[in-house]
């Protein structure tokens, strides 16, 4: 057999035995002569250096460039490839010699008591146990222990080759501590040397760079990059780095194994790249590759190197942010800078602190924006190294979809006496103000008798056929007043009023307000009754713990069976396809109340008294009367509002003042509370008594001291008291100048 590439000028060395394989018996002599065209050398098994004592290589007597290899008394271990080659070339001729030694069928490595085989637990990998044979056609099996297991060639993935050894999938013997080959010759077993099995891993789970991204430095700073490889057990890792300035003077690489918890199925390796003082040329892509021999994984990161620390706002930084009430608002501080700046947010000059409603960080987040969040927000970026500052103002405008004030106050059904003039009001608050408020109407019976898609408590009127109030044919005569603007509870509101000239027909009225961010509507049930009349005694709006009575008066000749009910807090659910039932026709939603009946010559009066009214007593009260002739039920509904008790407070301050003798002092003290507090004035802690010069007006709210005298100087106290306590404010009045002599003197 010939090995290597043929040379133009040289022929291959020629062997005296012209065979690829030679089989000889043990104890015989092996002799092979090799001839060629230049200096030759021999290589033989088990000793590549040519120092073996038993092997003799001699020059031929009959010619130049000829050498004879002689081995007397060959043994099984001499089995192998014998190679004759030209010195310093690849040109060679090879013969494979089997020395059949039935007492020692396996070739042993010189001085080896045992060998080592390295395997990986890869399902697809095979391993070769190098138990070579001195006989080519042996029946060889592989024994593995412990526990003992025998593997026999299967003509597929398990095989034995005398020149190579025993081939087997590595996972099959990964459990074993040692393996050996065994041959059976004439019922005799012959074993190769033992091979220790060493399982080596190869799997790399991941390679992680830290920091992983966004690495920024300025010239002269130290760069430290950590590359961590996580692998399976029994793995060795080789790290390789690629980076822009490979010839770096101040580069340092440290590789080490990291300790993992005992019992861990994983190993960790760390490679740290350090560059002490980076330059602009160190900017670029840094790649760390970890290799286990059978597997390589890599990871990259970009390192940016700035000339010096800096800070600036990015081009995408907003100056105006528009939002609608209730939305989440995010205003990111878009900046360019190194190192990352300190970010501070201010609203109208006041620093913002994070809490559950607002997060002031890289992004200013307002969880649920409200009107009071409107304003100018300033973000100040400070470079932590250079202390350079940049500021930017963002205006936040919060829009409010139209909200109709009365919506929360008015009951779903209110009754109006036939023939009366009534005014319906919609007070709209919206930002920006509504660009229109339109009124619509519809006959009550049309609405109540149309099949509806869905009716809910929030929208009890399923009707769709709304008509403009300009078209009041078949309804009440209407006039829409021009919108007015009012400051209510400190807010600019738009008030739209609709005047019903004469309440003749029961109808529904709807006001609809629209602005750029939404719409709001209020449906008013305008139920006209000729029936009973409700009055409240003694007050329209009682305060908690006061008593109130509802009087229902009906003409005795027309009506009978007067009954008081309270509308339940939640009317019964109305199912899809059902109609909203007028209060009178659905007594299931009503609670019957105890009341006392009185009569006079013409009327019956049913009085329902609430002693110690509470907030729970608020709601819609229904007086039901039955027509004596037709037995038809008539209902009147009245909403009762109970005011909460509020301790007295005094709005505004009394201020110390200096006045000259003979001038006047006018001060006012406005108190609020429920029940309304009584106001009293004191001078130097004694009750102030009215006289010709001291005048108290408007329920003692306003104090006037005319033609002040020196003795009017002192501490003045305004005190507002109710059953819930007192509130007071004080001021000192200084009177300057000399007292004029009076005529009496």
């Amino acid at each position: 057999a010939s090995v290597g590439l043929p040379s133009v000028s040289l022929d291959l060395p020629r062997l005296s035995i012209q065979k690829d394989i030679l089989t000889i018996k043990a104890n015989t002599t092996l002799q092979i002569t090799c001839r060629g065209q230049r200096d030759l050398d021999w290589l033989w098994p088990n000793n590549q250096s040519g120092s073996e004592q038993r092997v003799e290589v001699t020059e031929c007597s009959d010619g130049l460039f000829c050498k004879t290899l002689t081995i007397p008394k060959v043994i099984g271990n001499d089995t192998g490839a014998y190679k004759c080659f030209y010195r310093e070339t690849d040109l060679a001729s090879v013969i494979y010699v089997y020395v059949q030694d039935y007492r020692s069928p396996f070739i042993a490595s010189v001085s080896d008591q045992h060998g080592v085989v390295y395997i990986t637990e890869n399902k697809n990998k095979t391993v070769v146990i190098p138990c070579l044979g001195s006989i080519s056609n042996l029946n060889v099996s592989l024994c593995a222990r412990y526990p003992e297991k025998r593997f026999v060639p299967d003509g597929n993935r398990i095989s034995w080759d005398s020149k190579k050894g025993f081939t087997i999938p590595s996972y099959m013997i990964s459990y074993a501590g040692m393996v050996f080959c065994e041959a059976k010759i004439n019922d005799e077993s012959y074993q190769s040397i033992m091979y220790i099995v060493v399982v080596v891993g190869y799997r790399i789970y991941d390679v992680v760079l830290s920091p992983s991204h966004g690495i920024e430095l300025s010239v002269g700073e130290k760069l430290v990059l950590n590359c961590t490889a996580r692998t399976e057990l029994n793995v060795g890792i080789d790290f390789n780095w690629e980076y822009p300035s490979s010839k770096h003077q101040h580069k340092k690489l440290v590789n080490r194994d990291l300790k993992t918890q005992s019992g861990s199925e994983m190993k960790k390796f760390l490679s740290t790249l350090t560059i002490d003082g980076v330059t602009r040329s160190d900017q670029g892509l840094y790649t760390c590759a970890a290799s286990s021999g059978l597997m390589t994984k890599k990871n990259s990161t970009f390192v940016r190197v700035h000339e010096k620390p800096f800070v600036a706002f990015g081009s995408g930084m907003e100056s105006l942010v528009e939002a609608t009430v209730g939305e989440r608002v995010r205003i990111p501080a878009k900046y360019l800078g190194y190192p990352p700046p300190e970010i501070k947010w201010y609203k109208n000059g006041i620093p913002l602190e994070s809490n559950h409603t607002i997060k002031a960080g890289h992004v200013l987040t307002i969880m649920e924006v409200s009107e009071r969040d409107t304003g100018n927000y300033t973000v100040i970026l400070t470079n932590p190294i250079s202390k350079e500052k940049q500021s930017h103002v963002v205006s936040l405008v919060v829009y409010v979809p139209p909200q109709i004030g009365e919506k929360s106050l008015i009951s779903p059904v209110d009754s109006y006496q036939y023939g009366t003039t009534q005014t319906l009001t919609c007070t709209v608050y919206a930002i920006p103000p509504p660009h229109h408020i339109h009124w619509y109407w519809q006959l009550e019976e049309e609405c109540a008798n149309e099949p509806s898609q869905a009716v809910s408590v929030t929208n009890p009127y399923p009707c769709e056929e709304w008509r403009s109030v300009e078209d009041f044919q078949g309804g009440n005569k209407i006039e829409v007043n021009k919108n007015q603007f009012a400051l209510i509870e400190g807010k600019n509101k738009t008030v739209s009023t609709l005047v019903i000239q004469a309440a003749n027909v029961s109808a529904l009225y709807k006001c609809e307000a629209v602005n750029k961010v939404g719409r709001g509507e209020r449906v008013i049930s305008f139920h006209v009754t000729r029936g009973p009349e409700i009055t409240l005694q003694p007050d329209m709006q009682p305060t908690e713990q006061e008593s109130v009575s509802l009087w229902c008066t009906a003409d005795r000749s027309t009506f009978e069976n007067l009954t008081w009910y309270k509308l339940g807090p939640q009317p019964l659910p109305i199912h899809v396809g059902e109609l909203p039932t007028p209060v009178c026709k659905n007594l299931d939603t009503l609670w019957k109340l105890n009341a006392t009946m009185f009569s006079n010559s013409t009327n019956d009066i049913l009085i329902m008294e609430l002693k110690n009214a509470s907030l729970q007593d608020q709601g819609d009260y229904v007086c039901l009367a039955q027509d004596r002739k037709t037995k038809k039920r008539h209902c009147v509904v009245r909403q009762l509002t109970v005011l909460e008790r509020v301790a007295p407070t005094i709005t505004g301050n009394l201020e110390n003042q200096t006045t000259s003798i003979g001038e006047s002092i006018e001060v006012s003290c406005t108190a609020s509370g429920n029940p309304p507090p009584q106001i009293m004035w004191f001078k130097d802690n004694e009750t102030l008594v009215e006289d010709s010069g001291i005048v108290l007006k408007d329920g003692n709210r306003n104090l006037t001291i005319r033609r002040v005298r020196k003795e009017d100087e002192g501490l003045y106290t305004c005190q507002a008291c109710s059953v819930l306590g007192c509130a007071k404010v004080e001021a000192f009045f200084i009177i300057e100048g000399a007292q004029e002599k009076t005529n009496l003197e």
């Epitope: 003694p538 009575s549 009087w551 006079n600 009066i605």
Partner: nanobody, 124 residues
Framework: QVQLQESGGGSVQAGGSLTLSCEVS????????MGWFRQAPGKEREGVAG????????YYANFVQGRFTISQDNAKNMVYLQMNSLKPEDTAIYYC?????????????????WGQGTQVTVSS
């Protein structure tokens, strides 16, 4: 100072009659409304009858309708309650009450001034 003084109470057989008087001082019965209340043992005080400003209209609780009559004498500044066909369940302390001009004091919360009360006992 407003004062209301009841008189005319006493014991009577069922079916009998009594007239209660209420003498009012410091308060005009002609320009205000007046009423009568009663409180039976273990029960709440309840309105019996009322008369409005100037005596224009009179009001009666259902349980006394047709049996009791309220009236006033503006000259004497007196209010009366004529009780006929008395029943054992009419047994109570009867109070005179003064209210604002309108409405008549048929319930406690709109009463301004009270009398001390007079006992009426009806036996079967």
């Amino acid at each position: 100072q407003v004062q209301l003084q009841e008189s005319g109470g006493g014991s009577v057989q069922a079916g009998g009659s009594l007239t209660l008087s209420c003498e009012v001082s410091g308060y005009s019965v002609n320009s205000n409304s007046m009423g009568w209340f009663r409180q039976a043992p273990g029960k709440e005080r309840e309105g019996v009858a009322g008369i409005n400003e100037g005596g224009v209209s009179t009001y009666y609780a259902n349980f006394v309708q047709g049996r009791f009559t309220i009236s006033q004498d503006n000259a004497k500044n007196m209010v009366y309650l004529q009780m006929n066909s008395l029943k054992p369940e009419d047994t109570a302390i009867y109070y005179c009450a003064a209210g604002a001009p309108d409405p008549p004091p048929l319930i406690e919360s709109i009463v301004k001034y009270w009398g001390q009360g007079t006992q009426v006992t009806v036996s079967s």
